[in-house]
């Protein structure tokens, strides 16, 4: 029995077939964050729930110390949503007084760390200015895309202000990845 | 011929190989909503187009009565975008008068219903305060993530206010799922 | 050895198995845009980086002249994020003067072009009114969904105002697709 009986003619014969259910996958959900030190010039990383409720890791995709650890090389779809919640600061007043300034903002970054490479790589960024009219505001930032990762790469989610992350529900703030 | 010739050494031998084109998949698109009764304490569910235009269901993934029916257990990527549009409510006036109140908001929830379980499970939520300066406003909320589902599970999309959903174009408001 | 030993009983026997690593995939990242002519009644298309940094195309998925070219028929997950940035226009003043008007807006459309079909098909649209209080504003629009595409189809990303696209970082504005 020849491999090409199972595959279109353009497939490389050495490309392994593999069962989909056996691929590394993870979906992590929010927990309440605590203040931590973080590297200068880098936003703080969120930590996550990895086994309770909707959260899971499987097929050698492990979560440890704020990182998802990539167990095998390949193309992964990576996604995250962070819901922010805050109170309006004085930014609108300052602007109404005619003095434009750097706007308040909320930012989410999905970052890849490769031990052999000195600098983390920012894979995805969602950033939004915030200058709301109302007293309380809340809003999500969603990110998702495909990246070629190497075995041993580590993924984390960084945010501009960890105290604004809505930790209250596992469906509001989450982070996941799966091998394609 | 041994199965492991087709798979990396870490594959469980019992994991079945299966053709990708045979996996359950659906992409549903918006239709004009009609007011309907809905459960107390639960947002109303949207109903969807499942076969015209860009919409389709395939490989035993069926749509019926606002639900996508999951035909086999496994890990699914589920997504939805809902575009909302509205007129500014009185919220900004109230706040300008110095009386902070709960902000108007728009919310999308992707919900799982399991017949053997009494309560629906909220898988994904996108929620945003809305207190716009302009008279007319419109904006999308996008959600997407991976979940382990069981055969017979049902998925629906609930929104906080069905009358604000933009039903005018199939590319603005949609709902989909596919087995990984 | 029979094919069904590798697949669940519901698999069509003629459905080919194929290695995941051999599927068409692309992730394109933003470059600085230059003003170009575009079709009347159609938003301008973005052009993209396809090989430097995080960007790649593989397995016969090619990028040429603003288009991703689909090399084989099947179901694809397609996604894009565009980050916009701008200065507040006069919209809020006009409204404060009591004359409601059409709001300023930002729009992203993922479009499919099929040579045998005269009109492009809009697959996904994200559109948002913009009437910010602050002087400078920035925000992303994210889109992603699954579509059945045919060999030879072409995909592009169109935006309402090319001059507002944040081209500064490859993680802020991107476009991708992969065969499921």
């Amino acid at each position: 029995l020849k491999g090409q009986e199972f595959a279109p003619s353009h497939q490389q014969v050495y490309a392994p077939l593999r069962a989909d259910g056996d691929k590394p996958r993870a979906h992590l959900t929010v927990v309440r964050q605590t203040p931590t030190q973080h590297f200068k010039n880098q936003f703080p990383a969120l930590h996550w729930e990895h086994e309770l409720g909707l959260a899971f890791t499987k097929n050698r995709m492990n979560y440890t110390n704020k990182f998802l650890l990539i167990p095998e090389s390949g193309d992964y779809f990576i996604y995250s949503q962070v819901t922010f919640r805050g109170m309006t600061s004085e930014c609108s007043e300052i602007r109404q007084a005619g003095r434009p300034n750097k706007p308040d903002s909320i930012t989410v970054v999905i970052t890849k760390v490769t031990d052999s490479y000195p600098e983390p790589t920012q894979l995805l960024m969602g950033t939004k200015s915030v200058c709301e009219v109302g007293s309380n505001w809340f809003q999500p930032i969603y990110l998702g895309a495909m990246f070629s990762l190497q075995e041993g790469d580590k993924l984390m989610v960084n945010v501009s202000d960890i105290s604004l992350v809505d930790y209250t529900k596992e469906d509001k703030t989450f982070f996941g990845a799966f091998l394609l | 011929l041994k199965g492991q010739e087709f798979a990396p050494s870490h594959q469980q031998v019992y994991a079945p190989l299966r053709a990708d084109g045979d996996k359950p998949r659906a992409h549903l698109t918006v239709v004009r909503q009609t007011p309907t009764q809905h459960f107390k304490n639960q947002f109303p569910a949207l109903h969807w187009e499942h076969e015209l235009g860009l919409a389709f269901t395939k490989n035993r993934m069926n749509y019926t009565n606002k639900f996508l029916l999951i035909p086999e257990s496994g890990d699914y990527f589920i997504y939805s975008q809902v575009t909302f549009r509205g007129m500014t409510s009185e919220c900004s006036e109230i706040r300008q008068a110095g009386r902070p109140n709960k902000p108007d908001s728009i919310t999308v929830v992707i919900t799982k219903v399991t017949d053997s379980y009494p309560e629906p499970t909220q898988l994904l939520m996108g929620t945003k305060s809305v207190c716009e300066v302009g008279s007319n406003w419109f904006q999308p909320i996008y959600l997407g993530a991976m979940f382990s589902l069981q055969e017979g599970d049902k998925l629906m999309v609930n929104v906080s206010d069905i009358s604000l959903v933009d039903y005018t174009k199939e590319d603005k408001t949609f709902f989909g799922a596919f087995l990984l | 050895l029979k094919g069904q030993e590798f697949a669940p009983s519901h698999q069509q026997v003629y459905a080919p198995l194929r290695a995941d690593g051999d599927k068409p995939r692309a992730h394109l990242t933003v470059v600085r845009q230059t003003p170009t002519q575009h079709f009347k009644n159609q938003f301008p298309a973005l052009h993209w980086e396809h090989e430097l940094g995080l960007a790649f195309t593989k397995n016969r998925m090619n990028y040429t002249n603003k288009f991703l070219l689909i090399p084989e028929s099947g179901d694809y997950f397609i996604y894009s994020q565009v980050t916009f940035r701008g200065m507040t226009s006069e919209c809020s003043e006009i409204r404060q003067a009591g004359r409601p008007n059409k709001p300023d807006s930002i729009t992203v459309v993922i479009t499919k072009v099929t040579d045998s079909y005269p009109e492009p098909t809009q697959l996904l649209m994200g559109t948002k009114s913009v009437c910010e209080v602050g002087s400078n504003w920035f925000q992303p629009i994210y889109l992603g969904a699954m579509f059945s595409l045919q060999e030879g189809d072409k995909l592009m990303v169109n935006v309402s105002d090319i001059s507002l696209v944040d081209y500064t970082k490859e993680d802020k504005t991107f476009f991708g697709a992969f065969l499921l």
Epitope: R32, P35, T36, Q37, S89, N136, D161, Y167 | P100 | -
Partner: antibody, heavy 116, light 107 residues
């Protein structure tokens, strides 16, 4: 380990200004909010204001005209300044760090007496 | 501003008792209700956040419940070290506001 420590003048004359510094360790001010709360015998615990990681501030509207909160991220210090003090501003002043809805960690407080 | 009312200003209980302290908000605060413990030396600690979630390091004998406007803190098995004043605080709307406190004493 997360720690916050307030340092203030102790005694302030009526109509004068109060300045208190909160020095934090174990976390970065650039990405976490710090609240100010005071406790006086007559009023119990009273929230004064907050400075968020991104630098934005919110104040208790009853005190907004007299209050200013600022910070120096590089020195891990947050500053509270209150003008026109009167005797009913005598209290223990606390700084605390927290999420958007709660104060997770508190300093030990610094006592301020307004008296001539 | 939202008013937070703790009707019981002081409470006497015996070691080992189950003690419940209540707090009422003047309007719905969407479960954004926190409980703090203040020891006699002035030290303040967060015990419970978002109505019922235990802050890290807090013993499991503490629990919280409630919704809408009515909330409570329960100590299931009173210990000597629990002698303190307990404050509720709403975190739903600015300005954040506190209850007047319930002082817990040993009988």
């Amino acid at each position: 380990q997360i720690q916050l420590k307030e340092s203030g003048p102790g005694l302030v004359a009526p109509s004068q200004s109060l300045s208190i510094t909160c020095t934090v360790s174990g976390f970065s001010l650039s990405s976490y909010g710090v609240d100010w709360v005071r406790q006086s015998p007559g009023k119990g615990l009273e929230w004064l204001g907050v400075i968020w990681g991104f630098g934005g501030t919110n104040y208790n509207s009853a005190l907004k005209s007299r209050l200013s909160i600022s910070k120096d991220n590089s020195k891990s210090q947050v500053f509270l300044k209150m003008n026109s003090l009167q005797s009913d501003d005598s209290a223990i002043y606390y700084c605390a760090s927290g999420n958007f809805d709660a104060m997770d960690y508190w300093g030990q407080g610094t006592s301020v007496t307004v008296s001539s | 501003d939202i008013q937070m009312t703790q009707t019981t200003s002081s409470l006497s209980a015996s070691l080992g008792d189950r003690v419940t302290i209540s707090c009422r908000a003047s309007q719905d605060i969407s479960n954004y209700l926190n409980w703090y413990q203040q020891k006699p030396d002035g030290t303040v600690k967060l015990l419970i956040y978002y109505t019922s979630r235990l802050h890290s390091g807090v013993p499991s004998r503490f629990s919280g419940s409630g919704s809408g406007t009515d909330y409570s803190l329960t100590i299931s098995n009173l210990e000597q070290e629990d002698i303190a004043t307990y404050f509720c605080q709403q975190g739903n709307t600015l300005p954040f506001t506190f209850g007047s406190g319930t002082k817990l004493e040993i009988k």
